[in-house]
Amino acid sequence: KKVVLGKKGDTVELTCTASQKKSIQFHWKNSNQIKILGNQGSFLTKGPSKLNDRADSRRSLWDQGNFPLIIKNLKIEDSDTYICEVEDQKEEVQLLVFGLTANSDTHLLQGQSLTLTLESPPGSSPSVQCRSPRGKNIQGGKTLSVSQLELQDSGTWTCTVLQNQKKVEFKIDIVVLAFQKASSIVYKKEGEQVEFSFPLAFTVEKLTGSGELWWQAERASSSKSWITFDLKNKEVSVKRVTQDPKLQMGKKLPLHLTLPQALPQYAGSGNLTLALEAKTGKLHQEVNLVVMRATQLQKNLTCEVWGPTSPKLMLSLKLENKEAKVSKREKAVWVLNPEAGMWQCLLSDSGQVLLESNIKVLPTWSTPVQP
């Protein structure tokens, strides 16, 4: 008995071939011997089966001795043994229809779980293997689960159902709703304008929700909400903003925030959350601000950084075009009695300068100049 695998919602064509290459009488029946369709001369006739409106054949092939049964919009319950009667012969074809669906919406938040459920006919024992867009393979039976979805899981999942050494392939498009970056860090000199950008890693026609930026300043004992906003069809409107600092927000996507100036008291970490309409859970992006200040007080030239810096970073003070006078794994370094000239304060990681601030040290009788 020939086995054919079909996909729920698809169309399947079951073949039946006569030895004579001409149009002769044929019938397709199900396992209960109920006629599905056949012919009367060159006319297609249909029986009283449940497939009535979904069953068809290809009249153009009858003259070649081919009498296929075409079933459209397959259902799991169409799984059955179909019998083609032609030339006093009976050809049996077992059709097994499978369906694979995502547990809920195919638009899931980062960190949520994806469950794929296999619908299969009674008596079948299929195995399923799915390959994610990033090449990760998962195997299972009736259900497959992937916890903690990541951004790289966005895209087409290819799932293969195996039964009786036959395969049927499903493709499911999954969209992971997330920000492009989980975390970002901005390095600024004191007084500079700060731009925070929160690009989304997905595009949808209509995007509605609400968001908030909570900020934990390094110098503060507790975090506070800096801004809350609404999102209506990709249009941003600010609901509430603190007076200090007074953030400005762009009216269109991507979400964009401007801090008028970087100050040591603002250095720290923020968490932007975005709650999307009709979705449980929130999108998160962490943002960090590191602020540098170079100052000269009397005979002491000091360079300081505030904010979440890695212990791998080096802070250096050097006279322009000379070797560093001091270079340490600290957030503050200083030079006593600095000689006159342009001094550079450098924050570097693996030899790459992340932040630089220049300060001009004048001969002792003058006051310092900050360019």
Epitope: P311, M314, S327, K328, R329, E330, K331, S350, G351
Partner: antibody, heavy 119, light 113 residues
Framework: QVQLVQSGAEVKKPGASVKVSCKAS????????INWVRQAPGQGLEWIGW????????GYAQKFQGRVTMTRDTSTSTVYMELSSLRSEDTAVYYC????????????WGQGTLVTVSS | DIVMTQSPDSLAVSLGERATINCKSS????????????LAWYQQKPGQPPKLLIY???TRESGVPDRFSGSGSGTDFTLTISSLQAEDVAVYYC?????????FGQGTRLEIK
């Protein structure tokens, strides 16, 4: 896991220059820093300087300023250390070593290149 | 530059016994900003390059046997081998990387008694 493979031994005359190479095999330089450290026969370890092969930035010990030049060829994942105006006291094994980018300390070392300075 | 001084210069210990090597820095290598001691220990066997054993004064590098441990803070540090094995015969170096340039101790030769 990246490995560092160095060029072979060199014999040089005083006043000449030597150029030692250090190639990343089984990987590429990420945001790594490559240090150069030398060891005179029967002596301890002495740091010469560092280079970031991605940015090209360098930093040299005061003692070697003006005599040492570190360069790189990103297409072959190779860094070079050139020491000029050689003198007999530069006879040593020269090592390249990677600064661990995630933790700290020099976690991957080349096998060493013996440079002999002799008239 | 920070000067690193190791003691003793050489040490002979019986197999299975404890070996202790000291390292002193001329100034503190403890970062008050990050609360970390920027000190590493290396092992060098004859004809081989050094091998990283310990970083941040007390964190063992992956794959290093747990008989090796590092301790200390500020200016005084210790490398301890709890039970000496034959393969531990080597020269051991401490190195500070708190301040540039990084500097090494002169080395301690460890032998079997």
């Amino acid at each position: 896991q990246v490995q560092l493979v160095q060029s072979g031994a060199e014999v040089k005359k005083p006043g000449a220059s030597v150029k030692v190479s250090c190639k990343a095999s089984g990987g590429t330089f990420r945001n790594d820093v490559i240090n150069w450290v030398r060891q005179a026969p029967g002596q301890g370890l002495e740091w010469i300087g560092w280079m970031n092969p991605n940015s090209g930035n360098t930093g040299y010990a005061q003692k070697f300023q003006g005599r040492v030049t570190m360069t790189r060829d990103t297409s072959t994942s190779t860094v070079y250390m050139e020491l000029s105006s050689l003198r007999s006291e530069d006879t040593a094994v020269y090592y390249c070593a990677r600064d661990n980018p995630d933790l700290d300390g020099m976690d991957v070392w080349g096998q060493g290149t013996l440079v002999t300075v002799s008239s | 530059d920070i000067v690193m001084t190791q003691s003793p210069d050489s040490l002979a210990v019986s197999l299975g016994e404890r070996a202790t090597i000291n390292c002193k820095s001329s100034q503190s290598v403890l970062s008050s900003s990050y609360n970390k001691n920027y000190l590493a220990w290396y092992q060098q066997k004859p004809g081989q390059p050094p091998k990283l054993l310990i970083y941040w004064a007390s964190t063992r590098e992956s794959g290093v046997p747990d008989r090796f441990s590092g301790s200390g803070s500020g200016t005084d540090f210790t490398l301890t081998i709890s039970s000496l094995q034959a393969e531990d015969v080597a020269v051991y170096y401490c190195q500070q990387y708190y301040s540039s340039p990084p500097t090494f101790g002169q080395g301690t030769r460890l032998e079997i008694k």
